[in-house]
Protein backbone atom coordinates (compact mmCIF):
# COMPACT_ATOMS: atom_id res chain seq x y z
CA UNK A 1 0.00 0.00 0.00
CA UNK A 2 1.42 3.38 -0.97
CA UNK A 3 -0.08 6.45 0.63
CA UNK A 4 0.95 9.75 -0.89
CA UNK A 5 0.37 13.31 0.26
CA UNK A 6 0.30 16.58 -1.66
CA UNK A 7 2.90 19.12 -0.65
CA UNK A 8 1.99 22.23 -2.64
CA UNK A 9 0.55 25.53 -1.40
CA UNK A 10 -2.90 24.03 -1.28
CA UNK A 11 -3.75 21.51 1.43
CA UNK A 12 -2.56 17.98 0.80
CA UNK A 13 -4.95 15.09 0.34
CA UNK A 14 -4.30 11.41 0.90
CA UNK A 15 -4.02 9.23 -2.20
CA UNK A 16 -3.67 5.47 -1.80
CA UNK A 17 -2.57 2.92 -4.41
CA UNK A 18 -2.05 -0.83 -4.32
CA UNK A 19 0.74 -2.54 -6.25
CA UNK A 20 -0.74 -5.19 -8.51
CA UNK A 21 -0.11 -7.57 -11.37
CA UNK A 22 -1.68 -7.80 -14.79
CA UNK A 23 -2.31 -11.02 -16.69
CA UNK A 24 -1.26 -10.48 -20.31
CA UNK A 25 -4.15 -10.55 -22.76
CA UNK A 26 -6.69 -9.93 -20.02
CA UNK A 27 -8.01 -6.74 -18.42
CA UNK A 28 -6.24 -5.23 -15.43
CA UNK A 29 -7.08 -2.75 -12.68
CA UNK A 30 -4.69 -0.13 -11.35
CA UNK A 31 -6.11 0.71 -7.92
CA UNK A 32 -6.17 4.24 -6.56
CA UNK A 33 -8.39 5.91 -3.97
CA UNK A 34 -8.47 9.44 -2.57
CA UNK A 35 -10.34 11.64 -0.10
CA UNK A 36 -13.57 12.34 -1.95
CA UNK A 37 -14.93 15.77 -2.89
CA UNK A 38 -18.54 16.95 -2.92
CA UNK A 39 -18.45 18.24 -6.50
CA UNK A 40 -17.45 15.97 -9.39
CA UNK A 41 -16.50 19.02 -11.48
CA UNK A 42 -13.78 19.90 -8.94
CA UNK A 43 -11.99 16.53 -9.26
CA UNK A 44 -9.06 15.97 -11.61
CA UNK A 45 -7.54 12.51 -12.01
CA UNK A 46 -4.30 12.03 -13.92
CA UNK A 47 -2.63 8.69 -14.47
CA UNK A 48 0.99 8.88 -15.60
CA UNK A 49 3.59 6.22 -16.35
CA UNK A 50 7.30 6.59 -15.74
CA UNK A 51 9.16 6.87 -19.04
CA UNK A 52 6.03 7.60 -21.06
CA UNK A 53 5.65 11.06 -22.54
CA UNK A 54 1.87 11.34 -22.87
CA UNK A 55 -0.73 10.73 -20.20
CA UNK A 56 -2.10 7.29 -19.47
CA UNK A 57 -5.54 8.78 -18.69
CA UNK A 58 -7.08 12.03 -17.55
CA UNK A 59 -10.51 12.69 -16.08
CA UNK A 60 -11.61 16.22 -15.26
CA UNK A 61 -14.76 18.35 -15.05
CA UNK A 62 -16.79 15.16 -14.87
CA UNK A 63 -15.53 13.64 -18.11
CA UNK A 64 -12.57 11.94 -19.74
CA UNK A 65 -10.03 14.28 -21.32
CA UNK A 66 -7.76 12.22 -23.55
CA UNK A 67 -6.28 14.74 -25.97
CA UNK A 68 -2.86 14.22 -24.33
CA UNK A 69 -3.14 10.43 -24.03
CA UNK A 70 -0.07 8.46 -25.04
CA UNK A 71 -0.43 6.26 -28.12
CA UNK A 72 0.27 3.02 -26.25
CA UNK A 73 -2.89 3.49 -24.16
CA UNK A 74 -5.37 4.67 -26.80
CA UNK A 75 -8.69 2.88 -26.58
CA UNK A 76 -7.46 0.83 -23.63
CA UNK A 77 -8.18 2.84 -20.47
CA UNK A 78 -11.24 3.92 -18.51
CA UNK A 79 -11.97 5.20 -15.02
CA UNK A 80 -15.09 4.12 -13.17
CA UNK A 81 -16.82 7.45 -13.78
CA UNK A 82 -19.74 6.82 -11.44
CA UNK A 83 -17.34 6.01 -8.57
CA UNK A 84 -15.05 9.04 -8.87
CA UNK A 85 -17.33 11.09 -6.61
CA UNK A 86 -16.79 8.58 -3.76
CA UNK A 87 -13.00 8.70 -4.14
CA UNK A 88 -12.30 5.87 -6.55
CA UNK A 89 -9.73 6.84 -9.18
CA UNK A 90 -8.89 3.27 -10.20
CA UNK A 91 -8.08 2.68 -13.84
CA UNK A 92 -9.28 -0.19 -15.99
CA UNK A 93 -6.70 -1.33 -18.53
CA UNK A 94 -7.79 -3.37 -21.55
CA UNK A 95 -5.79 -6.28 -22.97
CA UNK A 96 -2.73 -6.00 -20.71
CA UNK A 97 0.61 -6.14 -22.55
CA UNK A 98 4.06 -7.03 -21.20
CA UNK A 99 5.12 -3.45 -21.93
CA UNK A 100 2.47 -2.11 -19.53
CA UNK A 101 4.71 -3.06 -16.60
CA UNK A 102 6.30 -0.17 -14.73
CA UNK A 103 5.75 2.61 -12.24
CA UNK A 104 2.49 4.53 -12.49
CA UNK A 105 1.50 7.70 -10.67
CA UNK A 106 -2.07 8.44 -9.64
CA UNK A 107 -2.28 12.23 -9.31
CA UNK A 108 -5.40 13.84 -7.84
CA UNK A 109 -6.59 17.43 -7.54
CA UNK A 110 -9.76 18.31 -5.63
CA UNK A 111 -11.08 21.48 -3.98
CA UNK A 112 -9.41 20.23 -0.77
CA UNK A 113 -5.94 20.02 -2.30
CA UNK A 114 -3.58 17.83 -4.28
CA UNK A 115 -2.00 14.44 -3.73
CA UNK A 116 -0.35 11.57 -5.55
CA UNK A 117 0.92 8.05 -5.01
CA UNK A 118 2.99 5.66 -7.09
CA UNK A 119 2.02 2.14 -8.04
CA UNK A 120 4.27 -0.69 -9.22
CA UNK A 121 2.55 -2.71 -11.91
CA UNK A 122 3.97 -6.06 -12.91
CA UNK A 123 2.85 -7.96 -15.98
CA UNK A 124 3.09 -11.60 -16.84
CA UNK A 125 0.87 -14.60 -17.27
CA UNK A 126 -0.53 -16.93 -14.65
CA UNK A 127 -3.25 -19.54 -14.65
CA UNK A 128 -4.78 -22.21 -12.48
CA UNK A 129 -3.21 -25.67 -12.72
CA UNK A 130 -5.29 -28.80 -13.09
CA UNK A 131 -3.99 -32.12 -11.80
CA UNK A 132 -5.29 -35.36 -13.26
CA UNK A 133 -4.47 -39.03 -13.12
CA UNK A 134 -2.73 -40.03 -16.35
CA UNK A 135 -4.37 -43.32 -17.24
CA UNK A 136 -2.31 -43.65 -20.44
CA UNK A 137 0.92 -44.08 -18.50
CA UNK A 138 2.35 -47.50 -17.70
CA UNK A 139 2.59 -46.76 -13.96
CA UNK A 140 0.46 -44.62 -11.64
CA UNK A 141 1.17 -41.11 -12.92
CA UNK A 142 -0.17 -37.61 -12.26
CA UNK A 143 -0.23 -34.88 -14.86
CA UNK A 144 -0.32 -31.20 -13.86
CA UNK A 145 -1.22 -28.72 -16.60
CA UNK A 146 -1.52 -24.92 -16.59
CA UNK A 147 -2.25 -23.16 -19.89
CA UNK A 148 -0.54 -19.76 -19.55
CA UNK A 149 2.55 -18.67 -17.62
CA UNK A 150 5.22 -16.00 -18.09
CA UNK A 151 8.01 -15.57 -17.12
CA UNK A 152 8.91 -19.26 -17.00
CA UNK A 153 7.90 -20.58 -13.59
CA UNK A 154 9.33 -23.24 -11.34
CA UNK A 155 7.29 -26.38 -10.68
CA UNK A 156 7.58 -28.31 -7.44
CA UNK A 157 5.65 -31.42 -6.38
CA UNK A 158 4.82 -32.22 -2.77
CA UNK A 159 2.83 -34.89 -0.99
CA UNK A 160 0.95 -35.03 2.27
CA UNK A 161 2.30 -38.44 3.24
CA UNK A 162 5.94 -37.83 2.25
CA UNK A 163 6.30 -34.31 3.61
CA UNK A 164 9.63 -32.73 2.73
CA UNK A 165 10.35 -35.33 0.06
CA UNK A 166 12.13 -34.19 -3.11
CA UNK A 167 10.18 -35.32 -6.18
CA UNK A 168 12.51 -33.83 -8.79
CA UNK A 169 13.94 -37.27 -9.67
CA UNK A 170 10.48 -38.76 -10.28
CA UNK A 171 8.92 -35.84 -12.12
CA UNK A 172 9.37 -34.26 -15.53
CA UNK A 173 8.36 -30.69 -16.42
CA UNK A 174 8.08 -29.18 -19.88
CA UNK A 175 7.25 -25.69 -21.15
CA UNK A 176 5.51 -25.29 -24.50
CA UNK A 177 5.35 -21.85 -26.13
CA UNK A 178 1.79 -20.75 -26.89
CA UNK A 179 0.76 -19.43 -30.29
CA UNK A 180 1.27 -15.75 -29.38
CA UNK A 181 4.96 -16.56 -28.68
CA UNK A 182 5.07 -15.07 -25.20
CA UNK A 183 3.23 -17.22 -22.71
CA UNK A 184 3.88 -20.91 -22.20
CA UNK A 185 1.88 -23.97 -21.33
CA UNK A 186 3.27 -25.78 -18.28
CA UNK A 187 3.06 -29.57 -18.13
CA UNK A 188 4.55 -31.53 -15.27
CA UNK A 189 4.30 -35.29 -14.84
CA UNK A 190 4.84 -37.10 -11.52
CA UNK A 191 5.63 -40.83 -11.63
CA UNK A 192 5.33 -43.66 -9.07
CA UNK A 193 2.28 -42.23 -7.38
CA UNK A 194 0.77 -44.09 -4.43
CA UNK A 195 -2.91 -44.11 -3.64
CA UNK A 196 -4.46 -42.79 -0.41
CA UNK A 197 -2.28 -39.70 -0.66
CA UNK A 198 -2.69 -36.02 -1.53
CA UNK A 199 -0.27 -34.55 -4.05
CA UNK A 200 0.32 -30.86 -4.77
CA UNK A 201 1.71 -29.34 -7.93
CA UNK A 202 3.05 -25.85 -7.13
CA UNK A 203 3.80 -23.43 -9.96
CA UNK A 204 5.47 -20.13 -9.13
CA UNK A 205 7.10 -17.15 -10.82
CA UNK A 206 7.81 -13.64 -9.49
CA UNK A 207 4.20 -12.60 -10.09
CA UNK A 208 2.02 -15.47 -8.94
CA UNK A 209 1.95 -18.76 -7.13
CA UNK A 210 -0.60 -21.43 -8.00
CA UNK A 211 -1.26 -24.83 -6.49
CA UNK A 212 -3.22 -27.76 -7.79
CA UNK A 213 -4.02 -30.52 -5.31
CA UNK A 214 -5.28 -34.01 -6.01
CA UNK A 215 -6.34 -36.60 -3.47
CA UNK A 216 -6.31 -40.13 -4.84
CA UNK A 217 -8.05 -42.92 -2.95
CA UNK A 218 -9.33 -46.31 -4.11
CA UNK A 219 -12.88 -45.01 -4.30
CA UNK A 220 -12.56 -41.40 -5.48
CA UNK A 221 -10.43 -38.54 -6.77
CA UNK A 222 -10.74 -35.04 -5.28
CA UNK A 223 -9.21 -31.94 -6.85
CA UNK A 224 -8.65 -28.40 -5.61
CA UNK A 225 -6.65 -25.47 -6.95
CA UNK A 226 -5.93 -21.89 -6.01
CA UNK A 227 -3.87 -18.97 -7.25
CA UNK A 228 -2.29 -16.12 -5.34
CA UNK A 229 -0.66 -12.95 -6.63
CA UNK A 230 2.64 -12.28 -4.91
CA UNK A 231 3.06 -8.53 -5.06
CA UNK A 232 -0.11 -6.86 -3.76
CA UNK A 233 1.43 -4.16 -1.59
CA UNK A 234 -0.42 -0.94 -0.91
CA UNK A 235 1.18 2.49 -0.89
Amino acid sequence: LIIGFGISGRHSITVTTVASAGNIGEDGILSCTFEPDIKLSDIVIQWLKEGVLGLVHEFKEGKDELSEQDEMFRGRTAVFADQVIVGNASLRLKNVQLTDAGTYKCYIITSKGKGNANLEYKTGAFSMPEVNVDYNASSETLRCEAPRWFPQPTVVWASQVDQGANFSEVSNTSFELNSENVTMKVVSVLYNVTINNTYSCMIENDIAKATGDIKVTESEIKRRSHLQLLNSKAS
Epitope: G25, E26, D27, G54, H57, K63, D64, E65, L66, S67, E68, Q69, D70, E71, R74, G75, R76, T77, A78, R92, K94, N95, S179
Partner: antibody, heavy 119, light 107 residues
Protein backbone atom coordinates in the same frame (compact mmCIF):
# COMPACT_ATOMS: atom_id res chain seq x y z
CA UNK B 1 -27.72 13.53 -26.13
CA UNK B 2 -25.04 12.02 -28.32
CA UNK B 3 -25.60 12.42 -32.05
CA UNK B 4 -23.48 11.68 -35.10
CA UNK B 5 -24.21 12.66 -38.68
CA UNK B 6 -22.33 11.83 -41.85
CA UNK B 7 -22.44 13.93 -45.00
CA UNK B 8 -21.00 12.61 -48.25
CA UNK B 9 -21.20 12.94 -52.02
CA UNK B 10 -23.41 9.97 -52.88
CA UNK B 11 -21.78 9.21 -56.22
CA UNK B 12 -18.04 8.86 -56.84
CA UNK B 13 -16.29 8.12 -60.14
CA UNK B 14 -13.94 5.09 -60.18
CA UNK B 15 -10.33 6.00 -59.25
CA UNK B 16 -11.55 9.24 -57.64
CA UNK B 17 -11.45 10.00 -53.89
CA UNK B 18 -14.22 9.98 -51.32
CA UNK B 19 -14.60 12.61 -48.59
CA UNK B 20 -17.11 12.26 -45.77
CA UNK B 21 -17.58 14.57 -42.80
CA UNK B 22 -18.95 13.25 -39.50
CA UNK B 23 -20.37 16.01 -37.29
CA UNK B 24 -20.88 15.03 -33.66
CA UNK B 25 -22.75 16.58 -30.75
CA UNK B 26 -23.37 15.67 -27.12
CA UNK B 27 -19.74 14.79 -26.42
CA UNK B 28 -16.25 16.14 -27.01
CA UNK B 29 -13.77 14.71 -29.49
CA UNK B 30 -11.15 15.13 -26.75
CA UNK B 31 -12.96 12.46 -24.72
CA UNK B 32 -13.83 9.77 -27.25
CA UNK B 33 -12.48 8.28 -30.44
CA UNK B 34 -14.60 8.10 -33.59
CA UNK B 35 -14.76 4.85 -35.54
CA UNK B 36 -15.57 4.34 -39.23
CA UNK B 37 -17.44 1.28 -40.47
CA UNK B 38 -18.87 0.44 -43.86
CA UNK B 39 -21.49 -1.99 -45.10
CA UNK B 40 -21.51 -3.16 -48.69
CA UNK B 41 -24.89 -4.03 -50.23
CA UNK B 42 -26.15 -7.28 -48.76
CA UNK B 43 -22.88 -7.82 -46.91
CA UNK B 44 -21.60 -7.60 -43.39
CA UNK B 45 -19.95 -4.72 -41.55
CA UNK B 46 -16.29 -3.83 -42.10
CA UNK B 47 -14.31 -1.71 -39.65
CA UNK B 48 -12.14 0.80 -41.52
CA UNK B 49 -10.39 2.90 -38.90
CA UNK B 50 -10.52 5.18 -35.90
CA UNK B 51 -9.27 8.59 -34.85
CA UNK B 52 -8.55 8.81 -31.13
CA UNK B 53 -8.99 11.77 -28.79
CA UNK B 54 -5.28 12.52 -29.10
CA UNK B 55 -5.56 12.72 -32.88
CA UNK B 56 -3.66 9.49 -33.49
CA UNK B 57 -5.23 6.99 -35.86
CA UNK B 58 -5.49 3.25 -36.47
CA UNK B 59 -6.52 1.81 -39.82
CA UNK B 60 -7.61 -1.53 -41.18
CA UNK B 61 -4.62 -2.94 -43.09
CA UNK B 62 -6.94 -3.66 -46.03
CA UNK B 63 -7.38 0.09 -46.65
CA UNK B 64 -4.42 1.69 -44.86
CA UNK B 65 -2.73 2.85 -48.08
CA UNK B 66 -5.87 4.67 -49.25
CA UNK B 67 -7.42 5.98 -46.04
CA UNK B 68 -6.84 9.11 -44.02
CA UNK B 69 -8.88 10.22 -40.99
CA UNK B 70 -8.49 13.66 -39.40
CA UNK B 71 -10.56 16.00 -37.23
CA UNK B 72 -11.30 19.55 -36.20
CA UNK B 73 -12.03 19.29 -32.48
CA UNK B 74 -13.27 22.87 -32.18
CA UNK B 75 -15.93 22.21 -34.84
CA UNK B 76 -16.73 18.72 -33.54
CA UNK B 77 -16.05 17.30 -36.98
CA UNK B 78 -14.21 14.21 -38.17
CA UNK B 79 -13.03 13.91 -41.76
CA UNK B 80 -12.78 10.65 -43.66
CA UNK B 81 -10.90 10.55 -46.96
CA UNK B 82 -10.40 7.45 -49.09
CA UNK B 83 -8.51 7.50 -52.38
CA UNK B 84 -8.63 5.41 -55.55
CA UNK B 85 -12.19 4.15 -55.14
CA UNK B 86 -13.35 1.11 -57.07
CA UNK B 87 -16.87 -0.28 -57.59
CA UNK B 88 -16.39 -2.73 -54.68
CA UNK B 89 -16.03 0.30 -52.37
CA UNK B 90 -19.74 0.94 -52.95
CA UNK B 91 -21.24 0.83 -49.46
CA UNK B 92 -23.01 2.69 -46.70
CA UNK B 93 -20.33 4.47 -44.65
CA UNK B 94 -20.97 5.04 -40.95
CA UNK B 95 -19.19 6.95 -38.21
CA UNK B 96 -19.69 5.55 -34.73
CA UNK B 97 -18.66 6.12 -31.12
CA UNK B 98 -17.92 3.64 -28.42
CA UNK B 99 -19.90 3.21 -25.21
CA UNK B 100 -16.83 4.02 -23.07
CA UNK B 101 -13.25 5.16 -23.61
CA UNK B 102 -12.33 1.49 -23.85
CA UNK B 103 -13.53 0.08 -27.16
CA UNK B 104 -16.15 -2.51 -26.19
CA UNK B 105 -19.22 -1.75 -28.25
CA UNK B 106 -20.28 0.95 -30.71
CA UNK B 107 -23.22 2.58 -28.94
CA UNK B 108 -23.77 5.57 -31.18
CA UNK B 109 -23.99 5.47 -34.98
CA UNK B 110 -24.66 8.04 -37.64
CA UNK B 111 -27.49 7.41 -40.08
CA UNK B 112 -24.91 6.38 -42.69
CA UNK B 113 -24.18 7.81 -46.08
CA UNK B 114 -24.59 5.68 -49.19
CA UNK B 115 -21.62 5.94 -51.53
CA UNK B 116 -21.93 4.50 -55.02
CA UNK B 117 -18.79 4.10 -57.10
CA UNK B 118 -19.77 4.16 -60.73
CA UNK B 119 -19.02 5.96 -63.94
CA UNK C 1 -7.04 -11.04 -38.45
CA UNK C 2 -9.66 -12.47 -36.12
CA UNK C 3 -12.50 -14.04 -38.08
CA UNK C 4 -15.97 -13.91 -36.52
CA UNK C 5 -18.25 -16.69 -37.78
CA UNK C 6 -21.98 -16.37 -37.19
CA UNK C 7 -24.53 -19.14 -37.45
CA UNK C 8 -27.08 -19.74 -38.72
CA UNK C 9 -27.08 -17.45 -41.76
CA UNK C 10 -30.83 -17.04 -41.42
CA UNK C 11 -33.67 -18.42 -39.33
CA UNK C 12 -37.43 -18.20 -39.24
CA UNK C 13 -39.14 -18.24 -35.85
CA UNK C 14 -42.63 -17.85 -34.46
CA UNK C 15 -43.53 -15.15 -31.96
CA UNK C 16 -42.87 -16.36 -28.41
CA UNK C 17 -40.17 -18.86 -29.38
CA UNK C 18 -36.67 -18.86 -27.92
CA UNK C 19 -33.92 -17.83 -30.35
CA UNK C 20 -30.22 -18.65 -30.00
CA UNK C 21 -27.65 -17.04 -32.28
CA UNK C 22 -24.04 -18.18 -32.30
CA UNK C 23 -20.82 -16.28 -32.93
CA UNK C 24 -17.40 -17.94 -32.91
CA UNK C 25 -14.07 -16.12 -32.91
CA UNK C 26 -11.06 -17.67 -34.65
CA UNK C 27 -8.95 -16.85 -31.58
CA UNK C 28 -9.39 -15.64 -28.02
CA UNK C 29 -11.12 -12.25 -27.78
CA UNK C 30 -11.74 -12.28 -24.03
CA UNK C 31 -15.15 -10.72 -23.49
CA UNK C 32 -14.71 -8.00 -26.13
CA UNK C 33 -17.71 -9.06 -28.19
CA UNK C 34 -20.71 -6.89 -28.94
CA UNK C 35 -24.02 -7.70 -30.62
CA UNK C 36 -25.93 -5.35 -32.92
CA UNK C 37 -29.46 -5.38 -34.27
CA UNK C 38 -29.99 -3.85 -37.70
CA UNK C 39 -33.49 -3.37 -39.04
CA UNK C 40 -34.05 -2.74 -42.78
CA UNK C 41 -32.88 0.71 -43.88
CA UNK C 42 -31.53 1.55 -40.40
CA UNK C 43 -28.13 1.87 -38.76
CA UNK C 44 -26.98 -0.92 -36.45
CA UNK C 45 -28.10 -0.62 -32.82
CA UNK C 46 -26.01 -1.88 -29.92
CA UNK C 47 -27.73 -4.63 -27.93
CA UNK C 48 -24.94 -6.25 -25.91
CA UNK C 49 -21.39 -5.13 -25.12
CA UNK C 50 -18.61 -6.86 -23.20
CA UNK C 51 -20.20 -10.22 -24.21
CA UNK C 52 -22.94 -10.07 -21.60
CA UNK C 53 -23.81 -6.46 -20.69
CA UNK C 54 -27.19 -5.33 -21.94
CA UNK C 55 -27.04 -1.79 -23.33
CA UNK C 56 -29.35 0.89 -21.92
CA UNK C 57 -32.93 0.54 -23.09
CA UNK C 58 -32.51 -2.93 -24.57
CA UNK C 59 -35.37 -5.26 -23.52
CA UNK C 60 -34.38 -7.95 -21.04
CA UNK C 61 -35.44 -10.71 -23.43
CA UNK C 62 -32.02 -10.14 -25.07
CA UNK C 63 -29.16 -11.89 -23.27
CA UNK C 64 -25.51 -12.27 -24.25
CA UNK C 65 -23.13 -14.90 -22.95
CA UNK C 66 -19.75 -16.47 -23.63
CA UNK C 67 -16.05 -15.68 -23.44
CA UNK C 68 -12.80 -16.44 -25.29
CA UNK C 69 -14.05 -17.87 -28.60
CA UNK C 70 -17.70 -18.93 -28.22
CA UNK C 71 -20.49 -16.37 -27.84
CA UNK C 72 -24.27 -16.54 -27.87
CA UNK C 73 -27.10 -14.05 -28.19
CA UNK C 74 -30.40 -15.37 -26.84
CA UNK C 75 -33.83 -13.86 -27.36
CA UNK C 76 -35.95 -15.56 -24.70
CA UNK C 77 -39.32 -14.88 -26.35
CA UNK C 78 -39.06 -13.45 -29.83
CA UNK C 79 -41.39 -10.59 -30.79
CA UNK C 80 -42.52 -9.41 -34.23
CA UNK C 81 -40.41 -6.26 -33.89
CA UNK C 82 -37.25 -8.38 -33.52
CA UNK C 83 -37.24 -9.04 -37.28
CA UNK C 84 -33.75 -7.82 -38.21
CA UNK C 85 -30.18 -8.74 -39.06
CA UNK C 86 -27.98 -9.47 -36.04
CA UNK C 87 -24.23 -8.84 -36.17
CA UNK C 88 -21.53 -9.76 -33.69
CA UNK C 89 -18.23 -7.92 -33.57
CA UNK C 90 -14.94 -8.12 -31.70
CA UNK C 91 -12.97 -5.15 -30.41
CA UNK C 92 -10.22 -7.11 -28.66
CA UNK C 93 -7.54 -6.46 -31.26
CA UNK C 94 -6.98 -4.68 -34.57
CA UNK C 95 -8.50 -4.79 -37.02
CA UNK C 96 -11.85 -4.89 -35.26
CA UNK C 97 -13.99 -7.42 -37.14
CA UNK C 98 -17.63 -8.38 -37.50
CA UNK C 99 -19.47 -11.55 -38.36
CA UNK C 100 -21.40 -11.76 -41.62
CA UNK C 101 -24.71 -11.53 -39.77
CA UNK C 102 -27.77 -13.66 -39.04
CA UNK C 103 -31.09 -12.72 -40.63
CA UNK C 104 -34.01 -13.34 -38.28
CA UNK C 105 -37.40 -13.72 -39.93
CA UNK C 106 -40.71 -14.02 -38.12
CA UNK C 107 -43.20 -16.65 -39.31
Amino acid sequence: QVQMQESGPGLVQPSQSLSITCTVSGFSLTSYGVQWVRQSPGKGLQWLGVIWSSGSTDYNAAVISRLSISKDTSKSQVFFKMNSLQPDDTAIYYCARDITTIVEGFAYWGQGTLVTVSS
Amino acid sequence: IIVMTQSPKSMSMSVGERVTLSCKASENVGTYVSWYQQKPEQSPKLLIYGASNRYTGVPDRFTGSGSATDFTLTISSVQAEDLADYHCGQSYSYPFTFGSGTKLEIK
